[in-house]
Interface confidence: low
């Protein structure tokens, strides 16, 4: 398995944005093609999305177990691009794919959001604060 | 070494109670699922419910609801089924098995606690 | 609850042959959107609790030797072991872990 490239978790604010030229930005990580932003800040569901968004990446995704085991490996828990609009909707992506995998807690109406942690996904509430990461595609 | 220590036999009269412990190794519950499972003398395997350590959130198979209650306490890493009522048909041995949320099969199993109900 | 389905109850081999064990769910565990089948197979030796052999039909655990080989999808599925050894003397559980948990009722493995 490739590793990280870099592995100096600091705490300094990352504000550069993940860019298309074949590399990643400074003290983002890359693994298999992607960059991963590692975020220190708490926030909600939606404004994670949205702060993914204004560094040219999505809130955090897992397409394969490979990548989940990476990156739980890695990684402090945080919210992951994966939603319901109910505990009676499937569970979706956030570009509008079915997600790939069950996920714990599922059955409680109020947690409508994912979270990836140690050997796990769960659900949340989409309105309390968790870190978050980001992942751009090279 | 990841592993799974139960509790021993246990001998007990028919209307009586028992609680049976699941002790983990090498790894937090808080991670997992944990499980409980039965065997009767020369039967199969049948699943009676499960845990979220974490939260203490349970799901139990029908055929089990109201005989067997499962508990967790995380500050010592074990997981319990307390059996209520019992009669001969609970004698059998009860098994204890970790999933993980992603894989959900059963990766780790404890060496079973053998149930003898019996006046 | 989905039924899970296990035939011969039991069989009798001997050391060096081949075996294959059936197993079907009474509905699909193919979850589409992964494409992924839950099923996983456990071998029980006398006295001993289920140890995992084969999880997603197909994926043989960690250690396991490559003479047991689980394939199928969908509702059915085979459990195949070449070349039988004299440890491999067991009751072998299908469980199918899509929807809550149910196991097989077993196929026990005699040795001749």
């Known amino acids: 398995i490739p590793f990280l490239e870099q592995n100096n978790f600091s705490p300094n604010t990352r504000t550069q944005k993940a860019r298309h030229c074949g590399h990643c930005p400074e003290e983002w990580i890359t693994y298999s093609n992607s960059c991963y932003y590692i975020g220190k800040e708490r926030r909600t569901w939606e404004e994670s999305l949205l702060a993914c968004t204004s560094k040219n990446s999505s809130l955090l995704s897992i397409d394969n177990e490979e990548e989940m085991k990476f990156l739980a490996s890695i990684l402090p828990s945080s919210w992951i691009g994966v939603f319901r609009n109910s505990s009676h909707h499937p569970w979706v992506t956030i570009n509008g794919l079915a997600f790939k995998h069950k996920i714990k807690d599922s059955d409680n109406a109020e947690l409508n959001c994912a979270v990836l942690q140690v050997n796990r996904l769960k659900s949340a509430q989409c309105g309390s604060s968790m870190i978050y990461h980001c992942k751009h595609k090279l | 070494e990841v592993q799974l220590q139960q509790s021993g036999a246990e001998l007990v009269k028919p209307g009586a109670s028992v609680t049976l412990s699941c002790t983990a190794s090498?790894?937090?519950?808080?991670?997992?699922?944990m499980h409980w499972v039965q065997q009767r003398p020369e039967q199969g395997l049948e699943w009676i419910g499960r845990?979220?350590?974490?939260?203490?959130?349970?799901k139990y198979d029908p055929n089990f609801q109201g005989k067997a209650t499962i508990t967790a306490d995380t500050s010592s890493n074990t997981a319990y089924l307390q059996l209520s009522s019992l009669t001969s048909e609970d004698t059998a041995v009860y098994h204890c098995a970790r999933s993980r949320t992603l894989f959900w099969y059963f990766d780790v199993w404890g060496a079973g606690t053998t149930v003898t109900v019996s006046s | 609850n989905i039924m899970m389905t296990q035939s011969p109850s039991s069989l009798a081999v001997s050391a060096g042959e081949k075996v294959t064990m059936s197993c079907k769910s009474s509905q699909s565990v193919l979850y589409s959107s992964n494409q992924k089948n839950y099923l996983a197979w456990y071998q029980q030796k006398p006295g001993q609790s289920p140890k995992l052999l084969i999880y997603?039909?197909?994926t043989r655990e960690s250690g396991v030797p490559d003479r047991f080989t689980g394939s199928g999808s969908g509702t059915d599925f085979t459990l195949t072991i070449t070349n039988i050894q004299a440890e491999d003397l067991a009751v072998y559980y299908c469980?199918?872990?899509?929807?809550?948990?149910?196991f097989g009722g077993g196929t026990k493995l005699e040795i001749k």
């Open positions: 469980h199918q872990y899509l929807s809550s948990y149910t």
């Open positions: 845990i979220d350590p974490e939260n203490g959130y349970t």
């Open positions: 997603w039909a197909s």
């Open positions: 090498g790894f937090n519950i808080k991670d997992t699922y």
